[in-house]
């Protein structure tokens, strides 16, 4: 079927919003009143990839601009990007495999797990204003859960 | 050569767990998916559920509290285990590999084992 | 779940004839249509995925086509070792979902 998407809102376990520094990375810092505003709206489509009872695939593009999250190798290290992309193309139902993550919801909170990179986890520091990044642990210091808030279209 | 067989007890009595094996061959099971298929005599196909290549599992809702998939990817086995059979459960198993086309992993089905009848009578 | 609407249930044809088997999808499963063939004893053979993307060794007598809900199997000439059974497959979401089959006979 035609890729299905809703628009969403993500926080961190500490209830830091995510939102743009510079063109081509999110960080995660606490948000009140009218800054609610400056975060990041993603449409997130629901995407063929290892579905199970526990996991549903994924892409995380940002509302209304051709950029989605991405899983790539850097120096040897799975990392997470801003990607360009040509929006005549995207969102796609059959999405590239970088581009997938397993959302995986316990416990009313979600993970993203990289399709590309099985336990690496979009991720954010306990610091302010740190880079949303992709990270190899869970239970660690770093932010691995997530909350999910609905977007009117 | 892709090749997947079946093979386990052709008859279970009611209410026990039905255990089949599927070996399969030419290819690794880290790295594709297997999902495991049924027809009673003279009927449909109908989809039990799938083992993926990273080891988690989708099951078919009406037999998800009774159906296990596993596998062991050093053998080459995946596994299904179905529990409190009856009669309705006798069929033809099958075990068959998923789709690989063009580097996406498709959600269908291309290389299918030769199925092994298991009947659930007393 | 998706549900599949296969028809007709049963065909009888001859050798040379154009045959065409037709599935409806009860949501739109955009192109992840398939379609199998199976002869008795035997597991079933995959023939076209992707709604029109023929395996390879298929012979090019088999065709698909259609997108969305409506999907159309074709024989353009029978040839004495098509008849069979036929079932199409939608892998467009979980659970996947058979049609009801199509017996293909000799007239």
């Known amino acids: 079927a035609p890729v299905r998407s809703l628009n969403c809102t993500l926080r961190d376990s500490q209830q830091k919003s995510l939102v743009m520094s510079g063109p081509y990375e999110l960080k995660a810092l606490h948000l009140q009143g009218q800054d609610m505003e400056q975060q990041v709206v993603f449409s997130m489509s629901f995407v063929q990839g290892e579905e199970s009872n526990d996991k549903i695939p994924v892409a995380l593009g940002l509302k209304e601009k051709n950029l989605y999250l991405s899983c790539v190798l850097k120096d040897d290290k799975p990392t997470l990007q801003l990607e360009s992309v040509d929006p005549k193309n995207y969102p796609k139902k059959k999405m590239e495999k970088r581009f997938v993550f397993n959302k995986i919801e316990i416990n009313n909170k979600l993970e993203f797990e990289s399709a590309q990179f099985p336990n690496w986890y979009i991720s954010t520091s306990q610091a302010e204003n740190m880079p949303v990044f992709l990270g190899g642990t869970k239970g660690g210091q770093d932010i691995t859960d997530f909350t999910m808030q609905f977007v009117s279209s | 050569e892709v090749q997947l067989q079946e093979s386990g007890p052709g008859l279970v009595k009611p209410s026990e767990t039905l255990s089949l094996t599927c070996t399969v061959s030419?290819?690794?099971?880290?790295?594709?998916?297997v999902s495991w298929i049924r027809q009673p005599p003279g009927k449909g196909l109908e989809w039990l559920g799938l083992?993926?290549?990273?080891?988690?599992?989708y099951y078919n809702s009406p037999l998800k509290s009774r159906l296990t998939i596993s596998k062991d990817n050093s053998k080459s086995q995946v596994s299904l285990k179905l529990s409190s059979v009856t009669a309705a459960d006798t069929a033809v198993y099958y075990c068959a590999k998923q789709t690989n086309i063009w580097g996406y992993d498709l959600y269908s089905m291309d290389y299918w084992g030769q199925g092994t009848l298991v009947t659930v009578s007393s | 779940d998706i549900q599949m609407t296969q028809s007709p249930s049963s065909l009888s044809a001859s050798v040379g004839d154009r045959v065409t088997i037709t599935c409806q999808t009860s949501q739109d499963i955009d192109d992840d249509m398939n379609w199998y063939q199976q002869k008795p004893g035997k597991a079933p053979k995959l023939l076209i995925s992707?709604?029109?993307h023929l395996r390879p060794g298929v012979p090019s007598r088999f065709s698909g086509s259609g997108s969305g809900t409506d999907f159309t199997f074709t024989i353009s000439s029978l040839q004495p070792e098509d008849f069979a059974t036929y079932y199409c497959l939608q892998s467009d979401r979980f659970p996947l979902t058979f049609g009801q089959g199509t017996k293909l006979e000799i007239k």
């Open positions: 992707l709604g029109s």
């Open positions: 083992i993926w290549g990273g080891g988690d599992t």
């Open positions: 030419g290819f690794s099971l880290s790295d594709f998916g």
